[in-house]
Interface confidence: low
C-alpha cells in the first residue's frame, strides 16, 4: 500500500508501545506539570523527554476506540454518530456551545453532507484573551460564525490527505488553512497542532486542535511593514530587495530580528554589514528558512539550514523556543500567508558576513589573533582582501607567546594566504602563497588535513571576504632542503657527515618528497662501539641504514593518525604511530616533530634505527678509516658547540630556524 | 613614525566657519579608520566624528550633526572637518586621531591638537 | 547614549604605590558573541594629547609598561597602575567603543605627593 504518513507513523509506535495493554491502546507522553499529550515515537520513548521537559507515560484508547466494560483494553469501535456529538465525543464540549449559540451552525453539523471541522479543544477556548472571546459572542454571533466555519472544510479530509505546506479551502470566504505535516508526525492547522486526529462522524470527520485559529490576511512583508518593532529590519530588508520574496508565493520561516536585536550589535559591525550589499543578503538569507516551521512541531533539537546556507539549531526548553540553545524567541508562530515569523531579539550573523577578525573571535584562536594585532597585521584581517587566514588553536600558546619581532612579524606573514580558500578544494601536493611571500605545501591524508607542519583542527569559517581556517600548530615554512636543516642544526653533524660519506648529499638536496628521521649526535654516540663500527664499516651498508631513516613521502606528525606504514628509501617499511600527541617510529618516541624542509620534513630521533634485516645479526666488518675519520671530526665539532634550543619553547626554535 | 599635524584653528565669532585640516604621514592613509576628538576647556573629551577607510561612511554625535562635515582625501594623506553654525560650546582643542585598523574603534595615534576659540 | 563615569575623579599617592581607579558604563560593553569588552584607557600628561594604554579593557597597546593593567568586564572596569612612577602623572579616560556616540569618562586625575 501507499507510505505511511508520518503522523500514521508515530501513532502506529505509540500502538506498538500500548498493546501489552489490550487491543487498540496507544502510550502517550505527558509533560509534566502540563495537560500537553504527544502519542510517542522512539526517540521520544526512549529520552521520556518533550522539550527538555520529564514526561510520563499514560496508556489511552487510539483514535476511534473506546474501552468495553470488563474486557482488556479498547475493543469496540466509537459508534459513528453526527458531527455535532462527534465534537463531544472528541471531547471539544465548548465547541459544541458556540455552535449551539450561532443557530445556523449546529442544523448543519447534524444534516448530510460531508464536512471536516478543526476542532479547538475547550483549553484552547478557554486561554482565548477575554476581550477575544466577548467580541467573538457579540455582534448577534456573526463574528462567532464566521469563526467557526474557518474551521471547517466542506469535504472530508483525513490526516493521510494533510501534505506538508498544503492549503484547504474553509468555508468562511473560502480563507485558507495552512496545513504542515512535520516528518517527527506533528501536524498543525495554522500553526495549531493536531490533538486527536481522523475522529469519524456519518457527515465527516473531526480533528481536536490546541488553538482557535484565525485567518491569515498579511504576507510575511506586510507584517514586517506594520509593525513598529521592525523599523530597522523593514530598512534592511528594502536595502537588500529581498522584499520581492517575502511578498511572494511560497512558505517560509521568517527569524525577525527586532530594533532591539540590531541594537546590540556594536555600530562599526553593524555599520559595516548594512553598507555591504553581499553581506546584508546573506544575513537577512539567515534569518530566513526554506519552509514553514510552526512553534508546536518542535519538541527537541532539530537541524535547519537556512536561505543563507547556515545550519541553526532549532529546540525548546518547556515552553521556549530556542535558536542554538538560546531562548530568544520573544514572540512566536505570528502567520502570514506565505510562511510564519518568530520575533527573535538577537541577530543571527553567520560567518558568510564577518570579518576574519569576528570569525575568530568566536573561535578557540584569539591568542593568534592578538598576535596578529600586535604584528600590525590587522588591517589584512578586517579589510576586504580575499585571504584565508591559518589561525593555530589558544592550546598551542600555552607555554607562551613570542616577542613581537621581525622573525616574528615575518612568521604570521606566512599564516596567511594570498586567496580565500575552501578546505574541501585543497588537493595533495598543491602549493599556496602567503603574504610573507612563502610557497606553503598541502597535504592530504586518510584523516586530516595538513598545510605543512600544520594541521586543520576545526571546520573552516567562510567569512565576507576571508576563511578562517583553525590550526593545531604554529606553522613553520620551510626555510631550504632537508640537507639545508641538517646542517643548520649542530644536532646533526654527524648525521651530515654520514650522509656525505654514504653519497646521499644529492638526494637530499634535489626536489622530491622525502620523510626524515634524523638521528642526534648523542644517537650515534649512544651507539655501541661495534655497531657503530659496522655502520661506517663501508659506504654501502652506511648508505643502506640511512636511506631506512629515509621516507618516500612526506609524513607530517599531524598525518599519522594512529600508525602509518611508511615505506623507506632502503625498501622497508617504518612504523609510524601517534599516541597520546608523541610520535614514534618503530616503537621509539620522536624527540622532535615536523621540521619542515622544501623537498621533506624532518623528525628528530634519539636512536639510530635499525633495518629489520640487521636487528638479528652479528657483523664484524672493519672501520673504514675515512669514515671513521670524517665522524670524529663532526663528533668534536658538535662537543664544541653545544645548543640549547632543545630547552628553549617551541617558537623560540622556530624564530632561531629562521635566522639561519 | 605615526604622524598627525593639525591646523585651521582659530578665534571665531559665533555663528560663524572653520575648516579644520590633518596632515597624515608615515602609515597607508586610505588604510585606517580616522577620527576628530575635542577636549573641552573643562577637560572633558568629546568624540566629533568618524569617517571610515574609503570615506564612504561618516558618523557623528548629534551635537555637531548637520553642522560639521568630517571629509578625507587621500591622494594628499589629509582628514578635513568643516564646521558651520559654531556655537561656544565648541570652543575646545581639536585633535586628529587615527584609529587602530580598517574597522576597529578605538583611537590608537592622536595629534597634537589644533584650538578652536568661539567667542564674540 | 551610553554614559560613562570614572572614580575618583582625582587621587593623589606617593611614588612606588598600587593605584587603582574604576570606570562604570550605563550599559554593558560585552559584546557576546566574541566576548570581548569595548573599552579603552588613555593617559595624558599636563600638555600633550592623549595617548591609548590599553584595548579590549585588558590588552595593553605595545610599549605600555606592564605595570599598567586593565581588568572588568560588563559595565564595571578598572585601570591598576602597580607600582606609581613619577612620570604617571596624568589624567586617565576609559572610553567605550561598543556603540555610536563613542563616550569617554570624565577622567581621573592622578597626583604624586
Known amino acids: 500500500g501507499p507510505a505511511k504518513s508520518p503522523y500514521q507513523l508515530v501513532l502506529q509506535h505509540s500502538r506498538l508501545r500500548g498493546r501489552q495493554h489490550g487491543p487498540n491502546v496507544c502510550a502517550v507522553q505527558k509533560v509534566i506539570g502540563t495537560n500537553r499529550k504527544y502519542f510517542t515515537n522512539c526517540k521520544q520513548w526512549y529520552q521520556r523527554k518533550i522539550c527538555g521537559k520529564s514526561t510520563v507515560i499514560s496508556y489511552e484508547c487510539c483514535p476511534g476506540y473506546e474501552k468495553v466494560p470488563g474486557e482488556k483494553g479498547c475493543p469496540a469501535a466509537l459508534p459513528l454518530s453526527n458531527l455535532y456529538e462527534t465534537l463531544g465525543v472528541v471531547g471539544s464540549t465548548t465547541t459544541q456551545l458556540y455552535t449551539d449559540r450561532t443557530e445556523k451552525l449546529r442544523p448543519e453539523m447534524e444534516g448530510p453532507g460531508s464536512f471536516t471541522i478543526f476542532a479547538p479543544s475547550n483549553e484552547a477556548w478557554a486561554s482565548l484573551p477575554a476581550e477575544v472571546l466577548d467580541s467573538l459572542v457579540s455582534n448577534v454571533n456573526i463574528e462567532l460564525l464566521n469563526a467557526l466555519r474557518y474551521h471547517m472544510v466542506g469535504r472530508r479530509v483525513l490526516t493521510d490527505e494533510l501534505k506538508h505546506g498544503m492549503t484547504l479551502t474553509s468555508m468562511y470566504q473560502n480563507s485558507n488553512i495552512q496545513i504542515h505535516h512535520y516528518p517527527n508526525g506533528i501536524v498543525t492547522v495554522n500553526c495549531a497542532r493536531l490533538l486527536k486526529a481522523d475522529h469519524h462522524a456519518t457527515n465527516g470527520v473531526v480533528h481536536l486542535i490546541d488553538k482557535v485559529i484565525s485567518t491569515i490576511t498579511n504576507n510575511i512583508q506586510q507584517i514586517i511593514e506594520i509593525e513598529d518593532t521592525f523599523e530597522t529590519l523593514r530598512a534592511a530588508v528594502a536595502a537588500s530587495g529581498l522584499n520581492t520574496m517575502l511578498e511572494g508565493n511560497g512558505q517560509y520561516t521568517l527569524l525577525a530580528p527586532t530594533n532591539e536585536a540590531f541594537e546590540k550589535i556594536p555600530s562599526e559591525t553593524l555599520n559595516r554589514i548594512l553598507g555591504d550589499p553581499e553581506a546584508l543578503r546573506d544575513l537577512l538569507n539567515n534569518h530566513i528558512l526554506k519552509s514553514a516551521m510552526c512553534a508546536e512541531a518542535i519538541v527537541a533539537g532539530l537541524s535547519v539550514e537556512t536561505l543563507e546556507g547556515t545550519t541553526l539549531e532549532v529546540g525548546c526548553s518547556g515552553d521556549m523556543l530556542t535558536i542554538n540553545g538560546k531562548a530568544i524567541i520573544s514572540n512566536k508562530d505570528i502567520l502570514a500567508t506565505n510562511g510564519v515569523i518568530h520575533y527573535i531579539d538577537e541577530l543571527l550573523i553567520p560567518d558568510s558576513a564577518k570579518t576574519l577578525f569576528e570569525l575568530a573571535a568566536e573561535s578557540d584562536v584569539s591568542t593568534a589573533i592578538d598576535l596578529f594585532r600586535q604584528a600590525g597585521l590587522g588591517n589584512h584581517l578586517s579589510g576586504s582582501e580575499r585571504l584565508t587566514l591559518l589561525a593555530p588553536l589558544n592550546s598551542v600558546f600555552k607555554d607562551g607567546t613570542p616577542p613581537i619581532d621581525a622573525h616574528t612579524r615575518n612568521l604570521l606573514r606566512n599564516h596567511i594566504i594570498k586567496d580565500q580558500l575552501a578546505s574541501k578544494y585543497l588537493y595533495h601536493g598543491q602549493t599556496l602563497e602567503t603574504l610573507g611571500g612563502k610557497k606553503l605545501r598541502v597535504f592530504v591524508y586518510r584523516n586530516s588535513l595538513c598545510i605543512e607542519n600544520s594541521c586543520i583542527a576545526a571546520h573552516d569559517k567562510r567569512g565576507r571576504y576571508g576563511t578562517l581556517f583553525t590550526m593545531d600548530r604554529v606553522l613553520t615554512p620551510p626555510m631550504g632542503t632537508v640537507m639545508d636543516v641538517l646542517k643548520g642544526d649542530n644536532r646533526f653533524s654527524m648525521l651530515v657527515a654520514a650522509i656525505q660519506s654514504a653519497g646521499l648529499t644529492e638526494t637530499l638536496n634535489r626536489e622530491g618528497v622525502y620523510t626524515v628521521f634524523a638521528p642526534t649526535n648523542e644517537a650515534f654516540r649512544a651507539l655501541p662501539p661495534r655497531e657503530r663500527s659496522r655502520l661506517l664499516g663501508d659506504a654501502k651498508e652506511l648508505a643502506n641504514i640511512l636511506k631506512y631513516h629515509i621516507g618516500d613521502e612526506i609524513l607530517v606528525s599531524g598525518g599519522i593518525g594512529a600508525l602509518v606504514r611508511l615505506k623507506s628509501l632502503q625498501g622497508d617499511k617504518l612504523e609510524v604511530s601517534l599516541k597520546n600527541n608523541v610520535v614514534s617510529v618503530n616503537k621509539e618516541p620522536v624527540a622532535e616533530p615536523d621540521i619542515m624542509a622544501t623537498n621533506g620534513v624532518v623528525h628528530v630521533i634519539t636512536n639510530v634505527l635499525q633495518p629489520p634485516a640487521n636487528r638479528p645479526q652479528e657483523r664484524g666488518d672493519e672501520l673504514a678509516d675515512s669514515a671513521l675519520e670524517i665522524f670524529k671530526q663532526a663528533s668534536a665539532f658538535s662537543r664544541a658547540s653545544q645548543r640549547s634550543v632543545r630547552l628553549a619553547p617551541v617558537y623560540q626554535k622556530l624564530l632561531e630556524r629562521m635566522k639561519h | 613614525e605615526v604622524q598627525l599635524v593639525e591646523s585651521g584653528g582659530g578665534l571665531v565669532k559665533p555663528g560663524g566657519s572653520l575648516k579644520l585640516s590633518c596632515a597624515a604621514s608615515g602609515f597607508t592613509f586610505s588604510d585606517y579608520y580616522m577620527y576628530w576628538v575635542r577636549q573641552t576647556p573643562e577637560k572633558r573629551l568629546e568624540w566629533v566624528a568618524t569617517i571610515s577607510d574609503g570615506g564612504i561612511y561618516t558618523y557623528y554625535p548629534d551635537s555637531v550633526k548637520g553642522r560639521f562635515t568630517i571629509s578625507r582625501d587621500s591622494a594628499k594623506n589629509n582628514l578635513y572637518l568643516q564646521m558651520t553654525s559654531l556655537k561656544s560650546d565648541d570652543t575646545a582643542m581639536y585633535y586628529c586621531?587615527?584609529?587602530?585598523?580598517?574597522?576597529?574603534?578605538?583611537?590608537?595615534?592622536w595629534g597634537q591638537g589644533t584650538l578652536v576659540t568661539v567667542s564674540a | 547614549d551610553i554614559v560613562m563615569s570614572q572614580s575618583p575623579s582625582s587621587l593623589v599617592v606617593s611614588a612606588g604605590e598600587k593605584v587603582t581607579m574604576t570606570c562604570k558604563s550605563s550599559?554593558?560593553?560585552?559584546?557576546?558573541?566574541?566576548?570581548?569588552?569595548?573599552l579603552a584607557w588613555y593617559r595624558q600628561k599636563p600638555g600633550q594629547s592623549p595617548k591609548l594604554l590599553i584595548y579590549?579593557?585588558?590588552t595593553r597597546e605595545s610599549g605600555v609598561p606592564d605595570r599598567f593593567t586593565g581588568s572588568g568586564s560588563g559595565t564595571d572596569f578598572t585601570l591598576t597602575i602597580s607600582s606609581v612612577k613619577a612620570e604617571d602623572l596624568a589624567v586617565y579616560y576609559c572610553?567605550?567603543?561598543?556603540?555610536?556616540?563613542?563616550?569617554f569618562g570624565g577622567g581621573t586625575k592622578l597626583e604624586i605627593k
Open positions: 572610553q567605550q567603543y561598543y556603540r555610536y556616540p563613542y563616550t
Open positions: 586621531v587615527r584609529g587602530w585598523d580598517r574597522y576597529d574603534s578605538w583611537f590608537a595615534c
Open positions: 579590549w579593557a585588558s
Open positions: 550599559q554593558s560593553l560585552l559584546y557576546s558573541s566574541n566576548q570581548k569588552n569595548y
